[in-house]
Interface confidence: low
Amino acid sequence: MQGQDRHMIRMRQLIDIVDQLKNYVNDLVPEFLPAPEDVETNCEWSAFSCFQKAQLKSANTGNNERIINVSIKKLKRKPPSTNAGRRQKHRLTCPSCDSYEKKPPKEFLERFKSLLQKMIHQHLSSRTHGSEDS
């Protein structure tokens, strides 16, 4: 159970970081980034890694640069792995990052948050149904 909770705490921290970054969206480089949406079941971890690999950058404007860079770094930190994550790593059928529609930072962050919520929901459901992923 402890591994489960550690995973969930990190995942929900990522949601908070995304929420916080959304407040600084005007200080991000207005670059279009691959933003997975309506991710196929069992490809969530693949999509998650696409969000983490995306080159989200601070526009280096003013006082917010440091806090933005720190939070982007935190977004890229690897969460504790789960059996579900390990299983998905072996799937070769998931879309490549480049195949996803590219979106500006605001929509990119919204889609990232949406995926995180879906992953949390799935994780909670798997616990409810007795499948331990830790």
Epitope: Q13, D16, I17, D19, Q20
Partner: antibody
Framework: EVQLVESGGGLVKPGGSLRLSCAAS????????MNWVRQAPGKGLEWVSS????????HYADSVKGRFTISRDNAKNSLYLQMNSLRAEDTAVYYC?????????????WGQGTTVTVSS | AIQLTQSPSSLSASVGDRVTITCRAS??????LAWYQQKPGKAPKILIH???SLESGVPSRFSGSGSGTDFTLTISSLQPEDFATYYC?????????FGQGTKLEIK
């Protein structure tokens, strides 16, 4: 100034209900996970409940599960704790607390606390 | 639930002393730990986050170290305003838990 102000505490009989409120100001409330922590007279700190920025994820201490409900209204910059079926052991100062955020571990902003007394 | 055991539970020291408080977790919590200071009738105040990172505005005489199961809070040279109760808290798994507290008193 970053501030959390609790209200709603008071004297209530065992089995009764109370609703605590916490008004947040000076920061972007909708971006932070929030918690309730309590402290019984002369005792240590006890975490009660947490809720994430968008209310997606909620947790309770076993001692209050099924009796207390945490909620938030981001439009009103407010956090709530609905306390039902109160017991003498729920007597404590209740603190509204901001979790540090940005992926760090810690609770960095605390309210002044509101006192709940459960007694017949 | 993860248990945190602080030692000592109380401590008498003098101004200028170096003081160390320990916090031991019942299982590995990585660096998901914070330290707080509380004075009578006041709300706790965060000193250290992520086991060893000094919170902004906290004097540099406070420091935290450790990871896994063993953690320490050190005050390098006690000042009169440091006499208070200190708590550790873990964020590794729910329920979040606190240590029982260490009361630091004037000798």
């Amino acid at each position: 100034e970053v501030q959390l102000v609790e209200s709603g505490g008071g004297l209530v009989k065992p089995g009764g209900s109370l609703r605590l409120s916490c008004a947040a100001s000076g920061f972007i409330f909708s971006s932070y996970s929030m918690n309730w922590v309590r402290q019984a007279p002369g005792k240590g700190l006890e975490w009660v409940s947490s809720i994430t920025s968008g209310s997606y994820y909620i947790h309770y201490a076993d001692s209050v599960k099924g009796r207390f409900t945490i909620s938030r209204d981001n439009a009103k910059n407010s956090l709530y704790l609905q306390m039902n079926s109160l017991r003498a052991e729920d007597t404590a100062v209740y603190y509204c607390v901001r979790e540090r955020g940005w992926g760090y571990y810690g609770m960095d902003v605390w309210g002044q606390g509101t006192t709940v007394t459960v007694s017949s | 639930a993860i248990q945190l055991t602080q030692s000592p539970s109380s401590l008498s020291a003098s101004v200028g002393d170096r003081v160390t408080i320990t916090c031991r977790a019942s299982q590995d919590i990585e660096s998901a730990l914070a330290w707080y200071q509380q004075k009578p009738g006041k709300a706790p105040k965060i000193l250290i986050h992520d086991a060893s990172s000094l919170e902004s505005g906290v004097p540099s005489r406070f420091s935290g170290s450790g990871s896994g199961t063993d953690f320490t809070l050190t005050i390098s040279s006690l000042q009169p305003e440091d006499f208070a109760t200190y708590y550790c808290q873990q964020f590794n798994s729910y329920p979040y838990t606190f240590g029982q507290g260490t009361k630091l008193e004037i000798k």
